[in-house]
């Protein structure tokens, strides 16, 4: 996973929605202990903006040496900075922990832009604000970088917390939460609430402000609005979803469904934008601009790179479109939608023009790697990661940002045929999705 | 080829309204691929942006000069307007207006100014 | 907000020989820099776009160059005609609305 901005066909068919309510999450269904209801201290547990990141603070060590960690649902290595770095205010040191043990064997880790490499151990790990337990974990230790670090981020390290498939050096590095799981009693799920400010925020208010929360073995309740709605876990590797409609202000794309999910579409908290494949970003933002044609905006602004500013408070939302991603359902022939406003997909930027105005970047990008439905869909909803049942679920954010007029919204049920023709089938050679 | 003529009145007592148009000829004002903007100059001084407009009326002002600044734009008559109330000497200025081109990040064609003076 | 600062503000030279004029941004504006020309008693004239392009009828000895924070503009040789004052102009942040505060090129 890029943190930062990173980091033969068929089509599927949206319908109108069904009379009858499909299965998906009550209060009636069977569910481990512990897994619902209200999660006190690990709400709010995390800091942080969409550009640069969100982390949760963990311990590392004995006696314990806290760090800030950047949360990141796109790849699997626990990983942190153990080396003095000119952007880190403070790094794991390995010599002064008496539980590290040192496994000897070293980690490379590229990436498109920038890479990490490191030495693998094992040490204690625990979340002062997550379950009340410690677990033995294995950590890679950051020795050298290059573009990994963000400036002003406050966080040293990662929690990748995707499954072994895709860890470094390979799968026979246990993830940090397949040893949570596996040492301790905490349920095989946990859900995210990113909340995205609405506004830029310079270094004091971000260090200063709520970012979200990550629920650790469980769902609370008073982190969304209206039903949870559950998609298949598609191969767990990423955590992999199929997309089979795409909608602009309820135009649909009318693409090949398969379109979507060229190689993969994954749920990234580590990726800033909606990344979407080359074909379907052209024609999505071909889309977006006749919808808000009232308005002409330069190439740059397209392509995430110029900033368009408004007065303060007077930026037009209503000019630009919703955005609707069909999911495949839980029940064969049935979808659901999830819906972001443009609150969502553009993103505000600091520092760059005066106080009286309002800066955006726009938060959608072309990928080359499938679909990466980054932090600009993610502010928008709680989401869950029901490893246990190898589902994601979506509900409506409680802190998403919206106007008076319109709100994010996950609705269902649709009947959708073919949704399996819709996943795309990656040929097989190694590692050949890694370098993402 | 497309040029633009600024024109108005060249003195302006204090506290009044100063008002320009700009007059695009070899062009349309109602082209979807610019914006229309109007820059000025203090005498010896630097450029100094007002704000732009686009086809539909959609405005953008400096942030300094926003309480008093209107842009309009009229494509039946191929022409965009300037209206700066409450002017004080300080207002006095070369005013240029521009097109915005190059992917409407630029002004790639100018008129040739008018010299406004604010005095009683 | 994005400064920009050109320097020096003024550069005494003779023609034939090379000038190399200056914009620093207080911040990264990417590419997204101009260059405009502006003799006396008339209007500026866009020179150069997105920090190296060359407008429509502008001579090859002017030549733009850099990117980030850094940026440069050379006529590789002077002739009569260019000395002027030059502004450069930012549109990281639409619409374009930043101007440096301009460096005079005077015959030495």
């Known amino acids: 996973t890029q943190h930062g901005i990173r980091l033969p066909l068929r089509s599927g068919l949206g319908g109108a929605p069904l009379g009858l309510r499909l299965p998906r999450e009550t209060d009636e269904e069977p569910e481990e202990p512990g897994r619902r209801g209200s999660f006190v201290e690990m709400v709010d547990n995390l800091r942080g903006k969409s550009g640069q990141g969100y982390y949760v603070e963990m311990t590392v060590g004995s006696p314990p040496q806290t760090l800030n960690i950047l949360v990141d649902t796109g790849s699997s290595n626990f990983a942190v900075g153990a080396a003095p770095h000119p952007f880190l205010h403070r790094y794991y040191q390995r010599q002064l922990s008496s539980t590290y043990r040192d496994l000897r064997k070293g980690v490379y880790v590229p990436y498109t832009q920038g890479k990490w490499e490191g030495e693998l151990g094992t040490d204690l790990v625990s979340i002062p604000h997550g379950p009340n337990v410690t677990v033995r974990a294995n950590i890679a230790a950051i020795t050298e970088s290059d573009k990994f670090f963000i400036n002003g981020s406050n966080w040293e390290g990662i929690l990748g917390l995707a499954y072994a498939e895709i860890a470094r050096p390979d799968d026979s590095l246990e993830p940090f939460f397949d040893s949570l799981v596996k040492q301790t009693h905490v349920p095989n799920l946990f859900s995210l609430q990113l909340c995205g400010a609405g506004f830029p925020l310079n270094q004091s208010e971000v260090l200063a402000s709520v970012g979200g929360s990550m629920i650790i073995g469980g769902i609370d309740h008073s982190l969304y609005t209206g039903s949870l709605w559950y998609t298949p876990i598609r191969r767990e590797w990423y955590y992999e979803v199929i997309i089979v409609r795409v909608e602009i202000n309820g135009q649909d794309l009318k693409m090949d469904c398969k379109e979507y999910n060229y190689d993969k579409s994954i749920v990234d908290s580590g990726t800033t934008n909606l990344r979407l494949p080359k074909k379907v970003f052209e024609a999505a933002v071909k889309s977006i601009k006749a919808a808000s044609s009232t308005e002409k905006f330069p190439d740059g602004f397209w392509l995430g790179e110029q900033l368009v500013c408004w007065q303060a408070g007077t930026t037009p939302w209503n000019i630009f479109p919703v955005i609707s991603l069909y999911l495949m359902g839980e029940v064969t022939n049935q979808s659901f939608r999830i819906t972001i406003l443009p609150q969502q997909y553009l993103r505000p930027v600091e520092d760059v023009a005066t106080s009286q105005d309002d800066c955006y970047k726009f938060a959608i990008s072309q990928s080359s790697t499938g679909t990466v439905m980054g932090a600009v869909i993610m502010e928008g909803f709680y989401v869950v990661f029901d490893r246990a049942r190898k589902r994601i679920g979506f509900a409506v954010s409680a802190c998403h940002v919206h106007d008076e007029f319109r709100t994010a919204a996950v609705e269902g049920p649709f009947v959708t045929l073919d949704m399996e023709d819709c996943g795309y089938n990656i040929p097989q050679t190694d590692e050949s999705t890694l370098m993402t | 080829q497309l040029q633009l003529q600024e024109s108005g009145p060249g003195l302006v007592k204090p506290s009044e309204t100063l008002s320009l148009t700009c007059t695009v000829s070899?062009?349309?004002?109602?082209?979807?691929?610019?914006?229309w903007g109007w820059i000025r100059q203090p005498p010896g001084k630097g450029l100094e942006w007002i704000g732009s407009?686009?086809?539909?009326?959609?405005?953008y002002y400096n942030p300094s000069l926003r309480s008093r600044v209107t842009i309009s734009v009229d494509t039946s008559k191929n022409q965009f307007s300037l209206k700066l109330s409450s002017v004080t000497a300080a207002d006095t200025a070369v005013y240029y207006c521009?097109?915005?081109?190059?992917?409407?990040?630029?002004?790639?064609?100018w008129g040739r100014g008018t010299l406004v003076t604010v005095s009683s | 907000e994005i400064v920009l600062t050109q320097s020096p503000a003024t550069l005494s030279l003779s023609p034939g020989e090379r000038a190399t004029l200056s914009c620093r941004a207080s911040?990264?504006?990417?590419?997204?820099l101009a260059w405009y020309q502006q003799k006396p008693g008339q209007a500026p004239r866009l020179l150069i776009y997105d920090a190296s392009n060359r407008a429509t009828g502008i001579p090859a000895r002017f030549s733009g160059s850099g990117s980030g924070t850094d940026f440069t503009l050379t006529i590789s040789s002077l002739e009569p005609e260019d000395f002027a004052v030059y502004y450069c102009?930012?549109?990281?942040?639409?619409?374009?609305?930043?101007f440096g505060g301009g460096t005079k090129v005077e015959i030495k």
């Open positions: 911040q990264s504006v990417s590419s997204y």
């Open positions: 102009q930012q549109s990281l942040t639409w619409p374009p609305r930043t």
């Open positions: 407009i686009y086809r539909s009326g959609s405005t």
């Open positions: 521009a097109r915005v081109g190059h992917g409407i990040s630029y002004f790639d064609l």
């Open positions: 070899g062009g349309s004002t109602s082209s979807s691929s610019y914006y």
